[in-house]
C-alpha cells in the first residue's frame, strides 16, 4: 500500500480467483484513543473500533472511503483504491489502446516545435467518476523539471455504439533550449482513477521524436502565363521554432481531387514555393516536416485549384 | 558565445553540401545497423544515449544562432578553446565565434572518425562478418573535415590487445551511430544557418 495523495491510498493486488489479497492497517488521524468506530462509504454498519482498523482487501467491495468517528463526529477519512495486477501485468482498463505507432500505446504526445512545450492525449470510453493527474520530468534518476497543467476533456466522438472521450494535457519543460541535443528522455506519468480503480500509464520520448509542425500558412496561387502550371507559395507556420534558417522545414506539395484514389501531382521542396499542375475540381495541399530530423509530417494546408 | 549574422556570402559556403551528405550517410548507416542488428538493442528506445564529445567540445553552445542567445537555457558555461583557421570561412568578415563553432565541429568529426575506425577494425575480425561501417560514411566524414580544413593534432587510433567482445562492439556501434546522427543534425542546422546568414 502507498499514499497517492493526502488520505488516498493505493492497494496493489494480485488479481486471480481466490487470491488472498492484502492485509491493510488503517490508523485514525486523531489524538483520541477511545470510543473510535469505523465505517465504509455511506454505510452506517460499524466495521470495527479502536484507533486502528485491520482489513483484508481482496476485491472492489473492500475498497472505498473508510471513516473513523467518535460520538457522531468524523475524525478522518482514508480512501482506498485498488491497483490490479493480472499475470504480473498491471491492468489497463481505463484507457483505450491507440495502437499507434505501436500496440499498447495509451498516451500519445506531440510538440509543434523545439521550445520544450508538448501536448499529450489519451482516450477512454468512461464518462463519469473519472479523474486524471499528470506528472512529467526530463530523465528519471536525476529528474529535471517539467510543468504540466490539468488534464481536460478535449473531444468527444461517437464510435459505433460507443462514445469515446479524449483528454489532453499541456506540459512545458522548465528550462528548455530549442537547439539542445537531448540525451535524456521526457517521462510522462498519468495517474487514472475510475471509481475505486487506480491505474498508471507512462510514456517516454525525446521532443525531437514527437515533433509535428503546424501546417504551412498563407497558401497562395499564381497561375503561370500560357501554361497549366500554377506557382503555389506559402510561409512557415507561426508556431515553428526560429530562426528558420537553423530550424528548417521541408515541404510536400500535392494536387489531388476529392478522392485519394484520384490521380495527383506531387513534388517535394525545401523552398516555400513550387510549380504544379492544377486541375479543375482539385485542391493544392502543402504539408511540412523538419528538414533534418524526419519526425511527423504536419497536417495538410489546402486551397482549391479554381 | 554565438554565431553572428555577418557570415559568409550566400553560395560561398562549401560545407553545406558536405554536411547534407554527412547526415544522409549516417542516417543510412543507422538504418542499416537497425535492420542488420534486429536482435540487438539498437533502437532509440533501447540504447543508452551517450555523447563521446561531452566535456571535450561544445558544438551546440559554440554554434548557437544569435536569436537563441537571449534564451538563458541555451547559454551553458562550458568554454573550450579551438584553433581558428578554416577554409569554410569563405569571407574575411568571419568572426572569431564562427571559427570557434566550425573548429568545434571539426573536433567532433575527428573524435567520431577515430571511434568508427577503431570499431570497424574490430568488426572486421568478427567471424560472423555481420556488419561493417559504410565506407561512404567514413569518406563523407573525411570530406567535411577537409572542407573545414583545420590543423589539429592527429589522434592516434586506439588499438586493443584483448579479444574483442563482438556483442558489445555492435551495441556500442548502435550507441555511436545514434549520437552521431543527432550531432550530424546539429551540424546540418548550423551550416544551413551560416549559409543563409
Amino acid at each position: 500500500i502507498w499514499e497517492l495523495k493526502k488520505d488516498v491510498y493505493v492497494v496493489e493486488l494480485d488479481w486471480y480467483p481466490d487470491a488472498p489479497g492484502e492485509m491493510v492497517v488503517l490508523t485514525c488521524d486523531t489524538p483520541e484513543e477511545d470510543g473510535i468506530t469505523w465505517t465504509l462509504d455511506q454505510s452506517s454498519e460499524v466495521l470495527g473500533s479502536g484507533k486502528t482498523l485491520t482489513i483484508q482487501v481482496k476485491e472492489f467491495g473492500d475498497a472505498g472511503q473508510y471513516t473513523c468517528h467518535k460520538g457522531g463526529e468524523v475524525l478522518s477519512h482514508s480512501l482506498l483504491l485498488l491497483h490490479k495486477k493480472e499475470d504480473g501485468i498491471w491492468s489497463t482498463d481505463i484507457l483505450k489502446d491507440q495502437k499507434e505507432p505501436k500496440n499498447k500505446t495509451f498516451l500519445r504526445c506531440e510538440a509543434k516545435n523545439y521550445s520544450g512545450r508538448f501536448t499529450c492525449w489519451w482516450l477512454t470510453t468512461i464518462s463519469t467518476d473519472l479523474t486524471f493527474s499528470v506528472k512529467s520530468s526530463r530523465g528519471s534518476s536525476d529528474p529535471q523539471g517539467v510543468t504540466c497543467g490539468a488534464a481536460t476533456l478535449s473531444a468527444e466522438r461517437v464510435r459505433g455504439d460507443n462514445k469515446e472521450y479524449e483528454y489532453s494535457v499541456e506540459c512545458q519543460e522548465d528550462s528548455a533550449c530549442p537547439a539542445a541535443e537531448e540525451s535524456l528522455p521526457i517521462e510522462v506519468m498519468v495517474d487514472a482513477v475510475h471509481k475505486l480503480k487506480y491505474e498508471n500509464y507512462t510514456s517516454s520520448f525525446f521532443i525531437r521524436d514527437i515533433i509535428k509542425p503546424d501546417p504551412p500558412k498563407n497558401l497562395q496561387l499564381k497561375p503561370l502565363k500560357n501554361s497549366r502550371q500554377v506557382e503555389v507559395s506559402w510561409e512557415y507556420p507561426d508556431t515553428w521554432s526560429t530562426p528558420h534558417s537553423y530550424f528548417s522545414l521541408t515541404f510536400c506539395v500535392q494536387v489531388q481531387g476529392k478522392s485519394k484514389r484520384e490521380k495527383k501531382d506531387r513534388v517535394f521542396t525545401d523552398k516555400t514555393s513550387a510549380t504544379v499542375i492544377c486541375r479543375k475540381n482539385a485542391s493544392i495541399s502543402v504539408r511540412a516536416q523538419d528538414r533534418y530530423y524526419s519526425s511527423s509530417w504536419s497536417e495538410w494546408a489546402s486551397v482549391p485549384c479554381s | 558565445r554565438n554565431l553572428p549574422v555577418a557570415t559568409p556570402d550566400p553560395g560561398m559556403f562549401p560545407c553545406l553540401h558536405h554536411s547534407q551528405n554527412l547526415l544522409r550517410a549516417v542516417s543510412n548507416m543507422l538504418q542499416k545497423a537497425r535492420q542488420t542488428l534486429e536482435f540487438y538493442p539498437c533502437t532509440s528506445e533501447e540504447i543508452d544515449h551517450e555523447d563521446i564529445t561531452k566535456d571535450k567540445t561544445s558544438t551546440v553552445e559554440a554554434c548557437l544562432p544569435l536569436e537563441l542567445t537571449k534564451n538563458e537555457s541555451c547559454l551553458n558555461s562550458r568554454e573550450t578553446s579551438f584553433i581558428t583557421n578554416g577554409s569554410c570561412l569563405a569571407s574575411r568578415k568571419t568572426s572569431f565565434m564562427m571559427a570557434l563553432c566550425l573548429s568545434s565541429i571539426y573536433e567532433d568529426l575527428k573524435m567520431y572518425q577515430v571511434e568508427f575506425k577503431t570499431m570497424n577494425a574490430k568488426l572486421l575480425m568478427d567471424p560472423k562478418r555481420q556488419i561493417f561501417l559504410d565506407q561512404n560514411m567514413l569518406a563523407v566524414i573525411d570530406e567535411l573535415m577537409q572542407a573545414l580544413n583545420f590543423n589539429s593534432e592527429t589522434v592516434p587510433q586506439k588499438s586493443s590487445l584483448e579479444e574483442p567482445d563482438f556483442y558489445k562492439t555492435k551495441i556500442k556501434l548502435c550507441i555511436l551511430l545514434h549520437a552521431f546522427r543527432i550531432r550530424a543534425v546539429t551540424i546540418d542546422r548550423v551550416m544551413s544557418y551560416l549559409n543563409a546568414s
Partner: antibody
C-alpha cells in the same frame, strides 16, 4: 492487370509525320496521366510530354514543342502521339507510360520502333 | 532543363556482391528522383520513387538514398536477373529528364 499495347513499327521518310497509338486496358483510362518517352538506338530515355485523358490537358518538352501532338480518345481508351517534320535523328523506340502520379511512370507500353530513312 | 549525370556509365560486378550507382542533379531537386531498371528489348521498370520509397513487387535488395543533388541506388547483393541498365529520372520540374544510364555487367 494494367496493360499498355502500342501500334506496330513504322518506317517514315524525312519531313513526314508519324502517329503512334497506345491502347490501355485494366483500370479506368481517365484515372491516369499518360506520357510519351523515346529512346534512340543505344541511347538513353527522353521525355516528350504528357496528356490528362480526363480533360485533354497536355504539356510538352520544349525540345518537341510545335512538332509533337499528344491526344487521347476516352471512348477507346487510346492515346496517340504524332510527331511531324521527321528527321533521321528521330529514329527511336517510342513508348507510352502511365501513372496516377504525374511525374514518374509505373506502367510502360512495349514500345514502337519508328525508323526515319530516305 | 535539369541535367542528370549518372556514374559510372558501366559497372562490372560479381554476382552476390553489392553495387552502387550514383546520380547527380545539376541543381537541387529535393527528393524528386526515381530509379528504373531496363533490360535489353524491354521497357523500363520502376524500382524506387522519391529517392528512397520502395515500390510494391520490387525485391528489398534495391534501395535508394539521397536528397538535394546527390542520389544513390544500391543493390545489396546482385542476382543474375539484376544485370541491366539503370536510369535515374528527376521530377522536380518540367521537362522531366533522365540520367544517361548505368549498365551493370557481369564481372
Amino acid at each position: 492487370q494494367v496493360q499498355l499495347v502500342q501500334s506496330g513499327a513504322e518506317v517514315k521518310k524525312p519531313g513526314s509525320s508519324v502517329k503512334v497509338s497506345c491502347k490501355a486496358s485494366g483500370g479506368t483510362f481517365s484515372d491516369y496521366y499518360l506520357h510519351w518517352v523515346r529512346q534512340a538506338p543505344g541511347q538513353g530515355l527522353e521525355w516528350m510530354g504528357w496528356i490528362d485523358p480526363e480533360n485533354g490537358d497536355t504539356e510538352y518538352a520544349p525540345k518537341f514543342q510545335g512538332r509533337v501532338t499528344i491526344t487521347a480518345d476516352e471512348s477507346t481508351s487510346t492515346a496517340y502521339m504524332e510527331l511531324s517534320s521527321l528527321r533521321s535523328e528521330d529514329t527511336a523506340v517510342y513508348a507510352c507510360a502511365r501513372n496516377k502520379e504525374l511525374r514518374y511512370f509505373d506502367v510502360w507500353g512495349q514500345g514502337t520502333l519508328v525508323t526515319v530513312s530516305s | 532543363d535539369i541535367v542528370m549525370t549518372q556514374s559510372p556509365l558501366s559497372l562490372p560486378v560479381t554476382p552476390g556482391e553489392p553495387a552502387s550507382i550514383s546520380c547527380r542533379a545539376s541543381q537541387s531537386i529535393s527528393i524528386n528522383l526515381h530509379w528504373y531498371q531496363q533490360k535489353p528489348g524491354q521497357q523500363p521498370r520502376l524500382l524506387i520513387a522519391f529517392a528512397s520509397q520502395s515500390i510494391s513487387g520490387v525485391p528489398s535488395r534495391f534501395s535508394g538514398s539521397g536528397s538535394g543533388t546527390d542520389f544513390t541506388l544500391t543493390i545489396s547483393s546482385l542476382q543474375p536477373e539484376d544485370f541491366a541498365t539503370y536510369y535515374c529520372q528527376q521530377s522536380n520540374s518540367f521537362p522531366l529528364t533522365f540520367g544517361q544510364g548505368t549498365k551493370v555487367e557481369i564481372k
